[in-house]
């Protein structure tokens, strides 16, 4: 058996770190035995077999001339192996941030902090947080570790599915390349990493009749479940064009009529989205999208954008009610109840 | 059944050295931070030392820094203290404890200690 | 690392409640939010009651609440009751050396 130790990483190459002392060691004959060393190509011996050092071939202070291939003859001139030297460094621990798009699965990416110029891989796991009472100490319920699933294809991601809205977990990233392995640990919390993708479908329609109107609605963003637990507030903001302020209204569904609309002129609309108790962050904004308010009776003079607030809308000369707005109350079972378990 | 098991404890000379294990099991050792804490008799309790999950990062109590070694053996689920240098001053109850840490993106913080075990008593006395 | 201030002793009749003070530095206790008590009854080991300043883990009462304010941490026990009796300390992580620091301690005599 050969008397190198296999290091992590593809088979003949062996590593070590620049400005440090590199031990090489012959592979195809045993431990302690005599070997000559050559550079791969060149006939200059390096280190004889009166060395002192056996199979063993020592580089002090190697640098990036020293890397390549290297071969090991025995005392009989037979072939005792070929090796090849890498240098890098040591592993460092990754840097790791974990998000979260709905409440039950959230995910975590990493990247290394310094690279180490080796063959790398990522070790990844997560493991549920419990602080044990005194009398709950005998009897430590399953909390893990359970293994990070990574992507395929080499994305530096793992996800975790089926997580507890109100657990914390910590998560396990070990940097490993063949001079060691180095973790980042992370406590993530959903609450606190929530960020819902932004509201899908916007439309922003006029109302007819109404100039100074639009009516703009949205959907839940498909990564939200589709029965959810618990549900999602929104904000919208909407400005005419050439206006650089944007106005904020928090609608109480997914549909919000704009009154104080500049009639004549196209507005952008956005909406965000945030977990319905405050947990976590606001989205980002979804693109805009636009609508201009219908041609109706318009007022005699468009106010100055200072007044939009207070300037009363014109109400068509038809004797029409205004189009009225649909409920949107969440239906009784999808009402929030949060008990903290 | 969570449980730590400390061992090691006994006479020594002032001046002399003694090496403390503690035991963990039923629960993952390696992912958890790990502590020693002491208590002299009739006293309070006095934090002596620290140690991250992997053992690569370690804290001491000015009382006993360059005297006392906080290590781990993650494949044997055991904690461990080298003490040299021992003083009557360091005569107590030695605990092992675990603690859950709080891991931020930069940094891991000492938390709290949620399992103790039964203690060891170290005894400095000529 | 200095030790946290606690008063030496603290006492109330069953049913009452009783509050015991922690008081740090802006390195310790004012500047984190890792302080945690702990109860010791006669030759046992301590048992955590409370963590991360007010949190209480799985299987203690909810008598035992804890609070802070700037550098000073209080545990108040309400309903108190014979069991009670004991010594308690409070922690903290010290900011330094990956360090933590004990309270001095608090002996509480359940009266009658």
């Known amino acids: 058996s050969s008397p190198c130790p296999q290091a992590w990483g593809p088979p003949g190459v062996q590593y070590g770190q620049p400005g440090r002392s590199v031990k090489l060691c012959c592979p195809g004959v045993t431990a302690g035995d005599p070997v000559s060393w050559f550079r791969d190509g060149e006939p200059k011996l390096l280190q004889g077999p009166d060395s002192g050092l056996g199979h063993e071939l020592v580089l002090a202070q190697a640098d990036s001339t020293d890397e390549g291939t290297y071969i090991c003859q025995t005392l009989d001139g037979a072939l005792g192996g070929t090796v090849t030297l890498q240098l890098g460094y040591p592993p460092a621990r990754p840097v790791v941030s974990c998000q979260a798009a709905d409440y039950e699965n959230f995910s975590c990416t990493w990247s290394p902090s310094q690279i180490s110029g080796l063959p790398t891989r990522y070790l990844t796991s997560y493991r549920k947080k419990t602080v044990l009472g005194a009398d709950s100490q005998r009897r430590s319920p399953s909390t893990g570790p359970w293994p990070c699933p990574q992507d395929p294809l080499g994305a530096a991601r793992c996800v975790v599915h089926g997580a507890e809205f109100w657990s914390q977990y910590r998560i396990n990233v070990t940097e490993v390349n063949p001079l060691g392995a180095s973790t980042r640990l992370l406590d993530v919390s959903l609450q606190s990493i929530l960020r819902p993708d932004p509201p899908q479908g916007l439309r922003v329609e006029s109302v007819p009749g109404y100039p100074r109107r639009l009516r703009a609605s949205w959907t839940y963003p498909a990564s939200w479940p589709s029965q959810p637990h618990f549900l999602l507030k929104f904000r919208l903001q909407y400005r005419p064009a050439q206006h650089p302020a944007w106005s904020t209204v928090e609608p109480a569904g997914l549909e919000e009529v704009i009154t104080d609309a500049v009639a004549g002129l196209p507005h952008a609309v956005r909406v965000s989205a945030r977990d319905f108790l405050d947990a976590g962050t606001w989205s980002t904004w979804s693109p805009e999208a636009w609508g201009t308010p219908s041609t109706g009776t318009i007022p005699k003079e468009i106010p100055a954008w200072g007044q939009l607030h207070t300037q009363p809308e014109v109400e068509p000369q038809v004797d029409s009610p205004a189009p009225p707005r649909p409920s949107l109350q969440p239906h009784p079972r999808l009402l929030d109840h949060r008990d903290s378990v | 059944e969570v449980q730590l098991l400390e061992s090691g404890g006994g006479l020594v000379q002032p001046g002399g050295s003694l090496r403390l294990s503690c035991a963990a099991s039923?629960?993952?050792?390696?992912?958890?931070?790990m502590g020693w804490v002491r208590q002299a008799p009739g006293k309070g309790l006095e934090w002596v030392s620290y140690i991250y999950p992997s053992g690569g990062s370690t804290g001491y109590a000015d009382s006993v820094k360059g005297r006392f070694t906080i290590s781990r053996d993650n494949s044997k689920n055991t904690l461990y203290l080298q003490m040299h240098s021992l003083r009557a001053e360091d005569t107590a109850v030695y605990y092992c404890?675990?603690?859950?840490?709080?891991?931020?993106?930069?940094?891991?913080?000492?938390?709290?200690?949620?399992?103790w075990g039964q203690g060891t008593m170290v005894t400095v006395s000529s | 690392q200095s030790a946290l201030t606690q008063p030496p002793s603290a006492s109330g009749s069953p049913g009452q409640s009783v509050a015991i003070s922690c008081t740090g530095t802006s390195s310790d206790v004012g500047g984190y939010n890792f302080v945690s008590w702990y109860q010791q009854h006669p030759g046992k080991a301590p048992k955590l009651l409370i963590y991360e300043v007010t949190k209480r883990p799985s299987g203690v009462p909810d008598r035992f609440s804890g609070s802070k304010a700037g550098n000073t941490a209080s545990l108040t026990v309400s309903g108190l009751q014979a069991e009670d009796e004991a010594d308690y300390y409070c922690?903290?992580?010290?900011?330094?050396?990956?360090?933590?620091?004990f309270g001095t301690g608090t002996k509480v005599t359940v009266l009658g």
């Open positions: 922690s903290s992580y010290g900011g330094s050396n990956n360090a933590g620091v």
């Open positions: 404890a675990r603690d859950e840490g709080y891991c931020s993106s930069t940094s891991c913080y000492f938390d709290a200690f949620d399992i």
């Open positions: 039923g629960f993952t050792f390696s992912w958890y931070f």
